[in-house]
């Protein structure tokens, strides 16, 4: 028996369902009573889901997995993983045994989009050209860790005096806080871009300083 899986990682959004595709080519006369199908975590060999001798043995993985029973006889051994979590990320091995056996691994990459950044200034009043200000760009509930870029009004990257911290919450999602310390010009716009490297999703935030008072562009 030959097992086939997709070579590319499966990308799944947090809280959605993902299908880990796995197939085999049944011989003529094949019946499910001959099939041993096991899905396991590749690294640890921990059982995820199994099907033995015509019987679905159920989910051993927080009761969030399912096979496609009606498609098994056609050689579709795919696994459905429901309500994907950050902790589900990793490699899964599909192990099929009929007379002989074969296995193949498929990777699951979990992702969550970052929120539109919120911008704050400190100090936020009585600002004069030449003052040092701290601009904080905050974006929430993304995965995996973000890439953060700062630019000025002319699109020139600002790389000095930037401190970025990323903290995972109890669900494993990251909150990003990036702080830019800059000396004010007469007026200027400062933009922060938070990029999710897996989703290639960019979230933008900016603040414009035009003398007094400071203005924030309206939410998109």
């Amino acid at each position: 028996v030959e097992v086939q899986v997709s070579e590319d990682p499966v990308v799944a959004l947090v809280d959605t369902d993902a299908t880990l595709r796995c197939s085999f080519s049944p011989e003529p006369g094949f019946s499910l009573a001959q099939l041993n199908l096991i899905w396991q975590l590749t690294d640890t060999k921990q059982l995820v889901h199994s099907f033995t001798e015509g019987r679905d043995q159920g989910s051993a993985y927080s009761n969030r997995t399912a096979l496609f029973p009606d498609l098994l006889v056609q050689g579709n051994a795919s696994l459905r993983l429901q309500r994907v979590r950050v902790t589900d990320e990793g490699s899964y091995t599909c192990f099929v045994s009929i007379q002989d056996f074969d296995s193949a691994a498929v990777s699951l990459q979990v992702a969550a989009p970052y929120s539109k950044p919120s911008m704050t200034l400190e100090p936020n009043k009585d600002l004069r050209p030449g003052n040092m200000v701290t601009i904080t760009c905050s974006s929430y509930q993304g995965y995996p860790e973000a890439e953060v870029f700062w630019k000025d009004g002319q699109g020139v990257p600002l790389t000095g005096n930037v401190t970025t911290s990323q903290m995972a919450n109890e669900r494993g999602l990251f909150d990003v806080h990036s702080v830019l310390r800059v000396v004010l010009g007469a007026n200027g716009t400062y933009s922060c871009l938070v990029r999710n490297p897996v989703l290639q999703q960019d979230a933008h935030g900016s603040v414009t300083i035009t003398g007094q008072p400071l203005t924030f562009p309206p939410e998109a």
Epitope: K45, L47, T52, R55, S103
Partner: antibody, heavy 117, light 106 residues
Framework: QVQLVQSGAEVKKPGESLKISCKAS????????MHWVRQRPGKGLEWIGM????????NYNERFKRKATLTVDKSISTAYLQWSSLKAEDTAMYYC??????????WGQGTLVTVSS | QIVLTQSPSTLSASVGDRVTMTCSAS?????MYWYQQKPGKAPKLLIY???NLASGVPIRFSGSGSGTSYTLTISSMQPDDFVTYYC?????????FGQGTKLEIK
């Protein structure tokens, strides 16, 4: 005919570890889940976990995850239960059992483990 | 985990009696399995998939039920049957057993 023959009785001191064997014959050892179950004196049956020899896949009862390690040696059709840091309350009969579909249809004779200082 | 509660814990009967014991699951299970255990021996599979007799088991044993309620019936008790019986489920992990029903001679 299917046979599961377990290693002999063991007397251990608290804190010691233990390795019990279960030698299978009469069927294709590689293709069937092997379970381990324990029974403390005068008590009921407790499922420890199971292992599939062919793939090496295992599943533990969370309760015993830190205590038990299941392994197999396919070349000699033998399953093993390793138990770490024994306590007096681990005194029990330990059984291996082969399963087909969803039933454990053949059981070993049991290995009596006594933990006493 | 699914908790299986067997009742009664102890049952007194005489040879020839019809005996029924029950196994109640804390949540629905697809199938129930029944084992017989004699003193000092390993458990032996009696009933699989709720109602199917395992190989070599006398037809006086029968099983039934669905959902959360299952029964094992012995139609005519024989001297050999006065031992302990366990139910077991494999509908979810961990696999669990009932606490047992012990049959005693009245």
């Amino acid at each position: 005919q299917v046979q599961l023959v377990q290693s002999g009785a063991e007397v251990k001191k608290p804190g010691e570890s233990l390795k019990i064997s279960c030698k299978a014959s009469g069927y294709n050892f590689n293709n069937y889940w092997m379970h381990w179950v324990r029974q403390r004196p005068g008590k009921g049956l407790e499922w420890i976990g199971m292992i599939h020899p062919n793939s090496g896949t295992f599943n533990y009862n969370e309760r015993f995850k830190r205590k038990a390690t299941l392994t197999v040696d396919k070349s000699i059709s033998t399953a093993y239960l390793q138990w770490s840091s024994l306590k007096a309350e681990d005194t029990a009969m330990y059984y291996c059992a082969k399963s087909t579909a969803l039933a454990t249809d053949y059981w070993g004779q049991g290995t009596l483990v006594t933990v006493s200082s | 985990q699914i908790v299986l509660t067997q009742s009664p814990s102890t049952l007194s009967a005489s040879v020839g009696d019809r005996v029924t014991m029950t196994c109640s699951a804390s949540s629905s299970v697809s199938y129930m399995y029944w084992y017989q255990q004699k003193p000092g021996k390993a458990p032996k599979l009696l009933i699989y998939d709720t109602s199917n007799l395992a190989s070599g088991v006398p037809i006086r044993f029968s099983g039934s039920g669905s959902g959360t309620s299952y029964t094992l019936t012995i139609s005519s008790m024989q001297p050999d049957d006065f031992v302990t019986y366990y139910c077991q489920q494999w509908s979810s992990y961990p696999l669990t057993f009932g606490q047992g029903t012990k049959l005693e001679i009245k």
